[in-house]
């Protein structure tokens, strides 16, 4: 009986010679449960797992706990991955997070996090960063240290508000903090001066809504 | 569509007096706290004053403190920040934003710089003799 092979991550796809961008099934080491997955296999060096994606506001990021979770939308365009599968993933291995932020004036920038993993859901997935590089700003614009993930129905931020509903999206959220790439979705010419958009304040700074963001992962010693 | 148009700048001679006014549109002072921030040449943006007219809560950074008076007029959603005693380290672009008044860390009373989402274009305001 043949074996099937599985990967837990774009960094095995690719180094199982699948060397292509595209949408692949994942699944964690001791799991029978699924999910698909874009995988970027091109930018430096190739081997990542996208976990977020902001486009073109085709998807509404404004969702429930379970939704952040389990993930939404699609892996070919805009999507969450899920909460869950990223959890386990990033306490199974060291990991490194890469976010790629594009503004409409055609201009791009990421921020580089040599260690990132997230909390399992008992902790509220709590993100921890370390080793910030990049072009994206000096600073981090997730607040540090780390915060516990909220969404609409979930408010676990450090605000007398709600930051998930006053900002809309699922996001870690301090009070309410200098990110939120979960935000909405403003077109150009309708993107400045926003409470609610897709913020990274290190490098657009306040009120600024971004065109593009991608958050991917990839193992640290890949 | 959010809106903040400053006004009001201009030169002045060491000792004297101006009132800077900020119009806000697309909101309601109510619901919104607004800080004035001032920028000098190859400086860093700081805050001046802030108000929270839901509560009356009013701001000033110690170097403005006895000197600059911030208030509201919530029936033309205008901020005013009048500014005594003019010195020529008080030169600058000022400056007015807004930020959701709820948007507070618990025990905390003001705001962080990048909290402040929308921003006038502002205003020049030079002290000199």
């Known amino acids: 009986k043949e074996e099937q092979i599985s990967f837990r991550d774009c960094a095995e796809v690719f180094k199982s010679g699948h060397t292509t961008n595209g949408v692949y099934t994942l699944t964690l080491p001791n799991s029978t449960e699924e999910v698909k997955a874009y995988c970027d296999m091109e930018a430096g060096g190739g081997g990542w797992t996208i976990i977020q994606r902001r486009e073109d506001g085709s998807v509404d990021f404004q969702r429930t706990w379970k939704e952040y979770k389990v993930g939404f939308g699609n892996p070919s365009g805009e999507y969450w991955l899920g909460n869950e599968f990223v959890s386990q993933l990033t306490n199974q291995q060291r990991y490194v997070l890469k976010i790629h932020l594009k503004d409409w004036e055609g201009n791009e920038a990421y921020s580089l996090y040599e260690h990132f993993y997230l909390s399992s859901e008992e902790l509220n997935y709590r993100i921890h960063l370390k080793g910030l590089t990049g072009t994206a700003g000096k600073i981090s614009s997730i607040s540090q240290p780390g915060n516990d993930f909220s969404t609409k129905d979930a408010d676990n931020d450090k605000c007398i508000c709600k930051c998930s509903q006053m900002l809309t999206g699922g996001w870690w959220f301090d009070a309410c903090g200098p990110s939120n790439l979960n935000g909405m979705y403003y077109p150009q010419r309708q993107n400045t001066n926003k409470f609610n958009g897709i913020k990274w304040y290190y490098w657009k700074g306040s009120g600024y809504s971004l065109k593009g963001t991608t958050m991917m992962i990839r193992p640290a010693d890949f | 569509e959010v809106q903040l148009v400053e006004s009001g700048g201009g030169l002045v001679q060491p000792g004297g007096s101006l009132r800077l006014s900020c119009a806000a549109s697309g909101f309601t002072l109510d619901d919104y706290a607004i800080g004035w921030f001032r920028q000098a040449p190859g400086k860093e943006r700081e805050g001046v004053s802030s108000?929270?007219?839901?509560?009356?809560?009013?701001y000033y950074a110690d170097s403005v403190k006895g000197r600059f008076t911030i208030s509201s007029d919530n029936s033309k959603n205008t901020v005013y920040l009048q500014m005594n005693s003019l010195r020529p380290e008080d030169t600058a672009v000022y400056y007015c934003?807004?930020?959701?008044?709820?948007?507070?860390?618990?025990?905390?009373?003001?705001?962080?710089?990048?909290?402040?989402?929308?921003w006038g274009q502002g205003t020049l305001v030079t002290v000199s003799s």
């Open positions: 934003a807004a930020v959701p008044a709820g948007r507070l860390r618990f025990g905390e009373q003001w705001y962080p710089l990048y909290e402040y989402d929308a």
């Open positions: 108000i929270r007219d839901n509560d009356g809560s009013t």
